[in-house]
């Protein structure tokens, strides 16, 4: 009966050689795609000269196949019942699932200009930067191909900096031939309720980006959760993309290819200001841009990005405060398209379908000494792109799952 099923499940979800969980965990059997929509700026001159609202038009999807590489350096530790690994990064462009090519051009914020002016607040250094920006004929905005914007290009302004700096810039640079981790997760051998929960990330139990509880590495990596998931649970997980742990709550029952799954979503409360959700106080790291921690829906991850003023939000500033989106025209947030969800099979705790949506923004501020930023009258959190990373269990796997797991229970 039920006890036998429970026993079988407990055995099969352990992360060790020979289990169903381990096989799919080392190399995901699901095809994962990452779709990008780029925010093409329509009025760069007006913004730069008159500090107008930025008019954007999203262009996409541009689709890449991701997470197709097996985990590397998989090492079991019998003493503390953990398994450590690296998650290699790789992206392959999928022309048939895209609206154009990687050579398509976009007008976007000049990443190097925005970042350098933020990192180097010293007025004299800004004067030096200004002379280099002018010399390199750089401006507040730039035209870049999709490939350059995502994976990197040699920046002409940074190339003139007379001391050693990384001159290659890209939103996801470096990506190919890199790996995320090392992750060390519990394998569940001694305690199945801890399976896949992260013990350490990069050798630490904390991130060193945030204060207090915000800095903790909580839960799993969202690919799976400990088995026997309850609707009342709050599912914690860590996402290195957003440099923080976050959580999902039950929303609805969903039938996925004949498999009953629980849809868990990231609630708006997770993005709320500390005024509405006091737990979020430690995600507010400065007082000016956040308007004394009253703004919400954007996360300053600059500490995690070598000081570059990167802000993460949901696409189209979904769940963000009006002051954030006010200077940007052309955004249309809606929950169905822009929220993140996980469809979890409750018995195994496996995520059988997911849609992870996030937007990458860059802060640009007025600068008295940088000519191309001189006329700005306000700060802008500028949307650069948003992405939708999705994965759905394949038909064959779903059949196997139905016959071996849900079928047995029903």
């Amino acid at each position: 009966g039920d006890l036998l099923i429970q026993k079988t499940i407990k055995k099969q979800v352990v992360l060790e050689e020979g289990t169903i969980a381990f096989k799919n965990w080392v190399k995901t059997g699901t095809e994962v795609y990452r779709q990008f929509w780029i925010f093409d700026v329509q009025n760069p001159q007006e913004v730069m000269m008159n500090s107008s609202n930025i008019q954007v038009k999203q262009r996409g999807p541009y689709t890449y196949r991701v997470r197709f590489l097996a985990k590397e350096n998989v090492t079991q530790d019998a003493e503390d019942n953990t398994v450590s690994f690296l998650q290699p990064n790789g992206a392959i462009f999928e022309p048939s699932l895209s609206v154009g090519t990687e050579a398509d051009n976009f007008t976007v914020l000049n990443l190097a200009v925005a970042a350098a002016s933020h990192i180097y607040q010293n007025q004299f250094v800004q004067m030096i930067l200004n002379s280099l920006i002018n010399k390199s004929k750089s401006s507040m905005f730039q035209v870049r191909t999709l490939r350059e914007l995502l994976w990197g290009y040699r920046d002409p302004f940074l190339s003139l900096v007379p001391y050693p700096v990384t001159t290659t810039v890209g939103l996801f640079y470096p990506y190919n031939n890199t790996a995320d981790g090392v992750y060390k997760v519990f394998n569940g051998k001694d305690n199945i309720s801890k399976v896949a929960i992260i013990d350490t990330y990069k050798g630490k139990r904390n991130l060193s980006y945030w204060e207090s509880h915000c800095d903790m590495i909580n839960g799993t990596d969202a690919a799976s959760f400990p088995p026997f998931v309850e609707k009342s649970q709050v599912l914690q997980f860590f996402s290195s993309d957003i440099c923080r742990s976050i959580y999902a709550v039950f929303e609805s029952d969903v039938n996925l290819k004949g498999i009953p799954v629980y849809r868990f979503v990231l609630p708006s409360k997770a993005f709320a200001s500390p005024v509405e959700n006091p737990d979020n106080y430690c995600f507010c790291t400065e007082k000016i841009i956040s308007k004394n921690c009253t703004s919400y829906g954007v996360l300053d991850i600059s500490k995690c990005k070598e000081g570059r003023p990167v802000y993460i939000s949901l696409p189209h500033f979904l769940y963000a405060s009006p002051d954030v989106s006010e200077p940007i025209d052309g955004l249309n947030p809606n929950e169905e398209e822009h929220r993140t969800y996980l469809d979890i099979e409750p018995i195994t705790g496996f995520t059988l379908q997911f849609a992870k949506r996030l937007q990458v923004n860059l802060l640009v501020k007025p600068s008295e000494k940088i000519q191309v930023l001189k006329n700005l009258k306000r700060n802008y959190i500028v949307p650069i792109l948003w992405l939708n990373e999705t994965g759905t269990i394949g038909d064959e796997k779903a059949n196997m799952f139905r016959s071996q797991v849900t079928g047995k229970i029903n």
């Epitope: 010293n122 007025q123 004299f124 200004n130 002379s131």
Partner: antibody, heavy 120, light 107 residues
Amino acid sequence: QVQLQQSGAELVRPGASVTLSCKASGYTFTDYEMHWVKQTPVHGLEWIGTVDPETGGTAFNQKFKDKASLTADKSSSTVYMELRSLTSEDSAVYYCSRGYGNYGAWFAYWGQGTLVTVSA
Amino acid sequence: ETTVTQSPASLSVATGEKVTIRCITSTDIDDDMNWYQQKPGEPPKLLISEGNTLRPGVPSRFSSSGYGTDFVFTIENMLSEDVADYYCLQSDNLPFTFGSGTKLEIK
């Protein structure tokens, strides 16, 4: 209070080099870059260049790029300017002056000046 | 390089009179002009910084105005202690450049 104490007057031979010093006190030395300014009756005040005491990074007026080199010693809160291959044109009063930092004003504090006389 | 043209080169003014010194820049520098006073044997002293801002402790008879390329420095009523050389400095771009100076004397 902020003080910039410069080294004494120098009489040097043409073709020689000289090193001037400027010791800072009364503020956090690494928070502000230090500038050097040349003054002569003919050319008036001219900005030579600056050194960032935190990093040791320098920036120069092109006119003085081959003439001056700037260094900073954090342990003694002192900046140095070496002038090379001196000619009579280099005879002047040289001032160090504190920069803007992240906030402040340009050249709000000055050393008392060092007179350099180049003569055979 | 932004050149700064200062006029007049010298000025003789009676006590209580108004003094006006002008600096014109070769490029638009917004309001990034500074004004200095230098007495014999002393380093220059900053009177007015960027944005026509009077420095703390500087008497209110000193003022400045201007934006872009044309700047004016004013002493509302001349005192004998104001006898000095006056310089303007543009701090908009590198290299910093000074005006050639104005020698202010008492009549």
